[in-house]
Interface confidence: medium
Amino acid sequence: SEAKVTRSCAETRQVLGARGYSLNLIPPALISGEHLRVCPQEYTCCSSETEQRLIRETEATFRGLVEDSGSFLVHTLAARHRKFDEFFLEMLSVAQHSLTQLFSHSYGRLYAQHALIFNGLFSRLRDFYGESGEGLDDTLADFWAQLLERVFPLLHPQYSFPPDYLLCLSRLASSTDGSLQPFGDSPRRLRLQITRTLVAARAFVQGLETGRNVVSEALKVPVSEGCSQALMRLIGCPLCRGVPSLMPCQGFCLNVVRGCLSSRGLEPDWGNYLDGLLILADKLQGPFSFELTAESIGVKISEGLMYLQENSAKVSAQVFQECGPPDPVPARNRRAPPPREEAGRLWSMVTEEERPTTAAGTNLHRLVWELRERLARMRGFWARLSLTVCGDSRMAADASLEAAPCWTGAGRGRYLPPVVGGSPAEQVNNPELKVDASGPDVPTRRRRLQLRAATARMKTAALGHDLDGQDADEDASGSGGGQQYADDWMAGAVAPPARPPRPPYPPRRDGSGGKGGGGSARYNQGRSRSG
């Protein structure tokens, strides 16, 4: 009979014995339970020590289940972070390799002599992507200034250009009034494209990393006193009652687990974070395509060089006006001009057929597709966590057996109290444990803020801006109305807001900078420019 079964502790002895409990501590039959702290003080199979040990074990079981349930989130975000990071870095390497091939073919020996400038550019782009670099404005302005210093003398082999003159030249080129634009619009267009793409890529991989860190921390659940007691009533007390095979009711489990997790949930910030990832992923394979940007770096630089060649008379006149006429090279020291075919090729335009292609091809599309599919499984994770935990056979009866009797916390029967949701408003009515109505605890608030910050950064990057400093959308030239080019991004983009001007002469990487720089006054003549 049922009375006989529940009078015996045989089943409990068998279960706890297998877990390494000393059978001396477990009576063969039920004893009076006045000594119990958590379980009903009725007949029991548990001594005080057994109850205390079971309390610790039930906590560990719960913690383990929560961490196991979320391990796929941590692993997925970590794996996606690694894959996207590798992809973006590979694309920068592919772009550098393509540019080397392109320029070696087009410009021959002259490229080889100046390859360090291009390598330096890619090194600084990597630094910016990896968060250790300076702003892209300065990186790109520096690159074009160095390029001009190397290329301008090649247009005028009959003149000598000492370092002071070259310094005047590069200052003139980076002047905020935009009076000299030796490379035409190419610097602005390249800056716009690279900045939007790198800012987006950086925000995206940072977002994945933040998500992984937040989740792995959030899954380490501290167990409050109330939660600990509720967990014991849920899965420990059936053992003490002598009915270890009587599984807790599903509703009972949901109320306990939701109570234990109530101040730990990351909704609605989690859903917004997933939205941010998806929005930015779409931009990275569409208008902010990393592949297209990587491919076009060489093309845009080449377009700039073409512009300089075609407008060399105008550019030179401006330079000679501002920096003074250069000294002619004595005839005996004059370099022989490069061979005709090389000189012609130096300024040849990169043709469409020569645009570098990448082995990655549709890589990004595949990565984004995989990400979409995985993020779909992550949505609702925190709301579903209690169901996942209660779906484990150690925690509750199978939900499909709801009509069958189960452990209610007091005995065998059906669980009658309402099942409450996970939100603070509902948890106030949790019948199983008193939940702090003030909402998330401090560590959870901090994690939610981290998610919010990552989401804001991603959504801002998706609009073409950088939360960490400069705006990727703004016009860098300092002149004109900030017109957007349809071939850069989407036709019909809104003109960006005006930006405060950059200081006229940013310090150069070699340490020189500031107005005057100790150079001869002759190289700074012309109209004065306030520093």
Partner: nanobody
Framework: EVQLVESGGGLVQPGGSLRLSCIVS????????MAWFRQAPGKGLEGVSG???????GYAESVKGRFTISRDNSKNTLYLQMNSLRAEDTAVYYC?????????????????????WGQGTLVTVSS
Amino acid sequence: EVQLVESGGGLVQPGGSLRLSCIVSRYTYATYSMAWFRQAPGKGLEGVSGLDSVGATGYAESVKGRFTISRDNSKNTLYLQMNSLRAEDTAVYYCVVDPASAKVTYGSWSTPSYAYWGQGTLVTVSS
């Protein structure tokens, strides 16, 4: 595992009507709270309407008087009748379910903390 399958979305002219359906593959669903959420292009999730096992219903201000939520326990199905549709109702509509029995009663139906989410059905209101 609970599965949710929405249907009934499509293209409709302003002022027109649509009825969304959501079939829930679990018989205990009668004790669950259910709701419809939507997400317009480039926007966040918005709670449209909720219904709990107690029978209480909740609606977003923007749809009150135009949308009606209901359920048929014998068919395990949740419905959303949408009348007088406007261009701003264009969105992907999601059916959501949670074992909490009284989300509307407790005033938390519009928070997107639901355990199960459908794949969504697109509603486009355009002339």
